[in-house]
Amino acid sequence: QGGTRSPRCDCAGDFHKKIGLFCCRGCPAGHYLKAPCTEPCGNSTCLVCPQDTFLAWENHHNSECARCQACDEQASQVALENCSAVADTRCGCKPGWFVECQVSQCVSSSPFYCQPCLDCGALHRHTRLLCSRRDTDCGTCLPGFYEHGDGCVSCPTSTLGSCPERCAAVCGWRQMF
C-alpha cells in the first residue's frame, strides 16, 4: 500500500531474465553486464560503457558495449551528433550537402555519401526546394535570363546580340536588324 511495487520477478517479464543461475535485473542503457546477480531477482553488476562505445537499450546479456561508428570522411560525412553511452554517433552531411544513398532500397542504416547541393543561383535559376535529404530542386530562370538548351542564358544587353523567340518572350524585345 502506498509506494510503487517493484516488478514481479518471474523470469518471463521484461525486467528480469535468467542470467546464469538466477533471474536478474538487467543493465540500463549505457551499461554493460560485468557479472550476473548472485541471488534470485537481484541486481546484476553493471558498468558504464567506456568512451567511444554505447548500448542504446536496457539489456540482460551484453557483456560489452558496441563500438561507436566513425563517420566516413572519404564519403564527406560529418557527425551530426557525437556518440554517447546510450546512442551511436549520428552521421550525416554538412550544410550545403545532401545524402546520396549507395543502395537502391534506402533505409536509415544504409551506406551513403554526401554530395554538394546544386547552387541554383550559380545556374541563374530560382530555388524551388531547398537541399536537405535530396538535391536542391531548381526552378525557372531568374529574371534577366532565358531557357536555352539545359541552361539559362543572360538576356542580351545590346541590339547586336541575337534574341531567339524564347529570349524575346522573356527579355521583352525582338532582335533588331
Epitope: 523470469c11 542470467i19 546464469g20 543461475l21 548472485t38 541471488e39 534470485p40 531477482c41
Partner: antibody, heavy 123, light 111 residues
Framework: EVQLVESGGGLVKPGGSLRLSCAAS????????MSWVRQAPGKGLEWVST????????YFPDSVKDRFTISRDNAKNSLYLQMNSLRAEDTAVYYC????????????????WGQGTLVTVSS | DIVMTQSPDSLAVSLGERATINCRAS??????????MQWYQQKPGQPPKLLIY???NVESGVPDRFSGSGSGTDFTLTISSLQAEDVAVYYC?????????FGQGTKLEIK
C-alpha cells in the same frame, strides 16, 4: 544411476597449477548447474565454484576468485576446475556436485556428490 | 556473506532417542515464502549426502525419522529415533545468495 567421478588431484608446490576433472553420467549433464566444494583435512565444507547450465556463467567466493576457473564440456559430460597460484590453504578434498533447481524459486541444492579427489599443496 | 552457525558442535545421543541440531543464519534465508537452506549428512570417508531441502522437505530415499523445521534465520534438524547408521557430521547450508555458505558442522555420536 547418477555418477560423478573426480580426477586430477595430487601433490603440487605452492604457486603451482592443477586441473581437476569430473566425469558425469546417468543424467542430462547439460541441463544442470554444477559445483565444486572442498573440505580441508578434518575441517568443514567450503563452496569453491558453480557454473550455470545454459549460458555457463561462473561464480566463485573471494578466497579463490582470480585464481580458479570453472568450465564444462557438455559434449563430454565433463566439469573442470583449473586451479592456479595454489597455496597451502587450498589443500583439501575437492568434491564435484550436481545442483538441482527446486520449483520456480531459483533455489539450488547439491543433490549428488562425487567421492572427491585430494589436492595437496606443499613444498 | 551469510554466516551459518550450528549448535552444538558435537552431540551424543542414545540409540532410539531424539537428536536435535540447530542452525542459525546471520540474516534471513527466506525468498518468496521458501527458506533456501538444506541439511547434509557426511559419514566418515564419504561425500556429503543431501537430507533436507527448503528447510523441511525430505529428499527422496531419506528415512522418515529425519525432519527439518524453521524459517527466516533459525532452523532445526531432528532425528526422531537415533540409529547406529546415523553417526555422522551434519551440515546446514544456505542457497539464498552467493557465496553459498555452510555451518561448521555438528558431530553426532552414540552415547
Amino acid at each position: 544411476e547418477v555418477q560423478l567421478v573426480e580426477s586430477g588431484g595430487g601433490l603440487v608446490k605452492p604457486g603451482g597449477s592443477l586441473r581437476l576433472s569430473c566425469a558425469a553420467s546417468g543424467f542430462t549433464f547439460s541441463s544442470y548447474a554444477m559445483s565444486w566444494v572442498r573440505q580441508a583435512p578434518g575441517k568443514g565444507l567450503e563452496w569453491v565454484s558453480t557454473i550455470s547450465d545454459g549460458d555457463s556463467y561462473s561464480y566463485f567466493p573471494d578466497s579463490v576468485k582470480d585464481r580458479f576457473t570453472i568450465s564444462r564440456d557438455n559434449a563430454k559430460n565433463s566439469l573442470y576446475l583449473q586451479m592456479n597460484s595454489l597455496r597451502a590453504e587450498d589443500t583439501a578434498v575437492y568434491y564435484c556436485a550436481r545442483d538441482r533447481i527446486y520449483g520456480s524459486v531459483q533455489y539450488y541444492a547439491m543433490d549428488y556428490w562425487g567421492q572427491g579427489t585430494l589436492v595437496t599443496v606443499s613444498s | 556473506d551469510i554466516v551459518m552457525t550450528q549448535s552444538p558442535d558435537s552431540l551424543a545421543v542414545s540409540l532410539g532417542e531424539r537428536a536435535t541440531i540447530n542452525c542459525r543464519a546471520s540474516e534471513s534465508v527466506e525468498f518468496s515464502g521458501t527458506s533456501l537452506m538444506q541439511w547434509y549428512q557426511q559419514k566418515p570417508g564419504q561425500p556429503p549426502k543431501l537430507l533436507i531441502y527448503a528447510a523441511s522437505n525430505v529428499e527422496s530415499g531419506v528415512p522418515d525419522r529425519f525432519s527439518g523445521s524453521g524459517s527466516g534465520t533459525d532452523f532445526t534438524l531432528t532425528i526422531s529415533s537415533l540409529q547406529a547408521e546415523d553417526v555422522a557430521v551434519y551440515y546446514c547450508q544456505q542457497s539464498r545468495k552467493l557465496p553459498y555458505t555452510f555451518g561448521q558442522g555438528t558431530k553426532l555420536e552414540i552415547k
